[in-house]
Amino acid sequence: MASTGLELLGMTLAVLGWLGTLVSCALPLWKVTAFIGNSIVVAQVVWEGLWMSCVVQSTGQMQCKVYDSLLALPQDLQAARALCVIALLLALLGLLVAITGAQCTTCVEDEGAKARIVLTAGVILLLAGILVLIPVCWTAHAIIQDFYNPLVAEALKRELGASLYLGWAAAALLMLGGGLLCCTCPPPQVERPRGPRLGYSIPSRSGASGLDKRDYV
């Protein structure tokens, strides 16, 4: 019963993680313009994402532009896109596998097979979480590095956008969900080691407790 509850919790967290990843990857809020210094009336704020960039005027008007050429994009952006898409597909696969092996479903009858399926789902979700974490951490590292690099002009300095924070949260949820699914898997039954097939039985250890005097330090 407790394992069913853990399974449900794990899957719920994973679903939230998947939704968070979807929103994080889709929103153009990975990098936001950093206006450093005082006495500046900001005329516009630039938002940059994996698929588009937006310019928000002080009037509130927003103009977004989808990146044109795939080949002209920086390699790190292309890699981030790919990792996000793979993570989303992988997390979706993990959830489908988890549902298949869940205690509350009858897709698989064998309990042992169910446990293995749920364990597999947990591993897949953990992997998906790691895949989300890679582009998010990489981008955050690049932003921070540029922010403190004196050779990067102020016009090019950026701050961490909301998508990155959401990405971290989503990765945590996916990994937590995956971890819980891995935990629900019961440990394999430790079988009593069978002695050699001899014609006589091995005498039991001395002492009422079954412990030998050598077991005491």
Partner: antibody, heavy 120, light 107 residues
């Protein structure tokens, strides 16, 4: 007192290369980035490029890529600029400057300038 | 690249005059503007950074103002030692660019 001491004037032949130096004193060499600026006779100022003395990282004006190479020697607190394949267009006064600490692409201290004359 | 335009390349002035030199950027430079003074045979000298901040040792007769794309350098009362060429420079984006310069000449 912050000082940027540049090497003396140079008269070079077309096609040749020249390396000018900029020795700094009066502050920690690695704390500020170093810029190089060109001023042709009677003309305005043009930014050539910049170097971070901490790690040797450089940024160049597209116009001077392949023309100028910036380097530093931390042990002697000296910045260098090498200009290659010189033509009469490269005849100018070249300045090394120090980037403002909080706004590195502003320039608070300037060397006295090095005059380069390209002539056969 | 951001273009910096100093509308007057030269100015005929008299001692004691109030002088105003203007500089216009091709796009918003968010006050990332410096003013330099250059006398013949010398290197430029930084007068003002951040559009309005006077550097140490610069006479209080100099002042900077402006925001967005338009900036101004003012000299309240022109002295002999102020006769020079003045350059503006944006350091908002790379490459940093300079104005063409405004030369002050005595009448």
């Amino acid at each position: 007192e912050v000082q940027l001491q540049q090497s003396g004037p140079e008269l070079v032949k077309p096609g040749a290369s020249v390396k000018i130096s900029c020795k700094t004193s009066g502050y920690t060499f690695t704390e500020n980035i170093r810029h190089w600026v060109k001023q042709s006779r009677g003309k305005s100022l043009e930014w050539i490029g910049t170097i971070n003395p901490n790690n040797g990282e450089t940024r160049y004006n597209q116009k001077f890529k392949g023309k100028a190479t910036l380097t530093v020697d931390k042990s002697s607190s000296t910045a260098y600029m090498e200009l290659r394949s010189l033509t009469s267009e490269d005849s100018a006064v070249y300045y090394c400057t120090r980037g403002i600490t909080k706004s590195p692409y502003g320039m608070d201290y300037w060397g006295q300038g090095t005059s380069i004359t390209v002539s056969s | 690249d951001i273009q910096m335009t100093q509308s007057s390349s030269s100015f005929s002035v008299s001692l004691g005059d109030r002088v105003t030199i203007t500089c216009k950027a091709s796009e918003d430079i968010y006050n990332r503007l410096a003013w330099y003074q250059q006398k013949p045979g010398n290197a430029p000298r930084l007068l003002i950074s951040g559009a309005t901040s006077l550097e140490a040792g610069v006479p209080s007769g100099f002042s900077g103002s402006g925001s967005g794309k338009d900036y101004t350098l003012s000299i309240t009362s022109l002295q002999t030692e102020d006769v020079a060429t003045y350059y503006c420079q944006q350091y908002w984006s790379t490459p940093p660019t300079f104005g063409g310069g405004t030369k002050l000449e005595l009448k």
